[in-house]
Interface confidence: low
Amino acid sequence: FERTRSLQDPCSNCPAGTFCDNNRNQICSPCPPNSFSSAGGQRTCDICRQCKGVFRTRKECSSTSNAECDCTPGFHCLGAGCSMCEQDCKQGQELTKKGCKDCCFGTFNDQKRGICRPWTNCSLDGKSVLVNGTKERDVVCGPSPADLSPGASSVTPPAPAREPGHSPQ
C-alpha cells in the first residue's frame, strides 16, 4: 500500500486523536488509551510519555497531545520538553561531577540551578561597589567615585574574578 498522500488516501481525512488502521478497512479509529496523535492523517498513534520516578506529570496525555512532565521537588528540568531532571543545589552553589559545591570567592549563583558566575566588575563601568557580593548575590555597583559627595567612602572593590565554575556533566 503506497504511503503517498492524495485526496483519495483513506488516511488523509483522519483528524488528530485518530489513526488510520493498518488492517486497511478502518478509516479513522480513535487512538487507544495511553496513546495520541497530534496531527491528522496518522497511520499510528504515539505512546503517551509517562512521567515516572524523578519526573512528575505537569499535563496529562490526551488523545491529541502528549503528556508533559516536570521534575519532583529538589530537581529541575533540562533539555527540550524536560527530557532530563537535574538535581537542585542551594543558592550559592553549583552542581559539579562530585555534587553540589559552594561558589568560589568572587563568584555567585542566585538560583538552585546553573553555574557560579563572577561578580560584576564595577570598575569596568567606572563605578564603585555599593554592596559587596556574596556566594548568593552579585555585587551592587554604585555611582562612580567622582560622583560621591566629599567625605563619602567607597567599599573596597572585590578581588579579581575567576573563570566561571564548571558546568554539570
Partner: antibody, heavy 116, light 108 residues
Framework: QIQLVQSGPELKKPGETVKISCKAS????????MSWVKQAPGKGLKWMGW????????TYADDFKGRFAFSLETSASTAYLQINNLKNEDMAIYFC?????????WGQGTTLTVSS | QIVLTQSPAIMSASPGEKVTMTCSAS?????MNWYQQKSGTSPKRWIF???KLASGVPARFSGSGSGTSYSLTISSMEAEDAATYYC???????????FGSGTKLEIK
C-alpha cells in the same frame, strides 16, 4: 452483530437509472470504508470502487467512471450505488462490502436485471 | 493496474487430499487476500494479509507467498470446502483493488 442489508432486486429498462442501498448496522458506520463489487451472471468478482464514509470521497475503478456514483446518508448508516443510463452489460449482482483493503463483511447482494 | 491470474481455473480434490491453488500478480504486491464464495451466496473473507485466517475459518486452510506469487492451501480437503476462491489485492495511489478470476474447487 454486524450486518449489511441491501435493497431488493431491480428490473430496469436500458437508459433508466437505478439506486441500490446498503444499510449498515452493528458498528460505527463512519469508521469503515464501503466497497462496491459487481458480479455478472456466471462471472467473477469485479471491484467497482469504494467510498470513504468519513469524508464522503469516492474512488472509482477505471471501468466504473462516468455512469456510476457512490453516495452516503451517514445519519442512516446507508451507502448508495447509483447507475445512470443503464446498459444490458450492467445486468449483475451488486454487493456492498465493509472496508476497502480487504472487505470483511458483505451484503447479501442486489440483483439488477436490465431488459427492454 | 495490477492483474491477478489464478490457477488452475477449475480443480477437483478427494476428501483428505491436500489442495494448493495459486495467484500470480503482474507486479509485486505487499499482501494478498482470499475470498470464498459458494453458489448463490455472498463472498466471505477467508484469508487476509497473505496468511491470517478470518474468523471461523478452519485451521486446515493456510495462505502464503510474497512479491508476485501467492497461494492458498487446504491441508486436508473436506466436502464443505467446495467453492470458488478469489484472490484480491489493494495497492497504488489512488489505491485500487483487483480480484483474480477465481479458482473453482470441486469435491470428487
Amino acid at each position: 452483530q454486524i450486518q449489511l442489508v441491501q435493497s431488493g432486486p431491480e428490473l430496469k429498462k436500458p437508459g433508466e437509472t437505478v439506486k441500490i442501498s446498503c444499510k449498515a448496522s452493528g458498528y460505527t458506520f463512519t469508521t469503515y470504508g464501503m466497497s462496491w463489487v459487481k458480479q455478472a451472471p456466471g462471472k467473477g468478482l469485479k471491484w467497482m470502487g469504494w467510498i470513504n464514509t468519513y469524508s464522503g470521497v469516492p474512488t472509482y475503478a477505471d471501468d466504473f467512471k462516468g455512469r456510476f456514483a457512490f453516495s452516503l446518508e451517514t445519519s442512516a448508516s446507508t451507502a448508495y450505488l447509483q447507475i445512470n443510463n443503464l446498459k444490458n452489460e450492467d445486468m449483475a449482482i451488486y454487493f456492498c462490502a465493509r472496508g476497502y483493503g480487504s472487505p470483511d463483511y458483505w451484503g447479501q447482494g442486489t440483483t439488477l436485471t436490465v431488459s427492454s | 493496474q495490477i492483474v491477478l491470474t489464478q490457477s488452475p481455473a477449475i480443480m477437483s480434490a478427494s476428501p483428505g487430499e491436500k489442495v494448493t491453488m495459486t495467484c500470480s500478480a503482474s507486479s509485486s504486491v505487499s499482501y494478498m487476500n482470499w475470498y470464498q464464495q459458494k453458489s448463490g451466496t455472498s463472498p466471505k473473507r477467508w484469508i487476509f494479509d497473505t496468511s491470517k485466517l478470518a474468523s471461523g475459518v478452519p485451521a486446515r486452510f493456510s495462505g502464503s507467498g510474497s512479491g508476485t506469487s501467492y497461494s492458498l492451501t487446504i491441508s486436508s480437503m473436506e466436502a464443505e470446502d467446495a467453492a470458488t476462491y478469489y484472490c484480491q489485492q489493494w495497492s497504488g495511489n489512488p489505491p485500487i483493488s483487483t480480484f483474480g478470476s477465481g479458482t473453482k474447487l470441486e469435491i470428487k
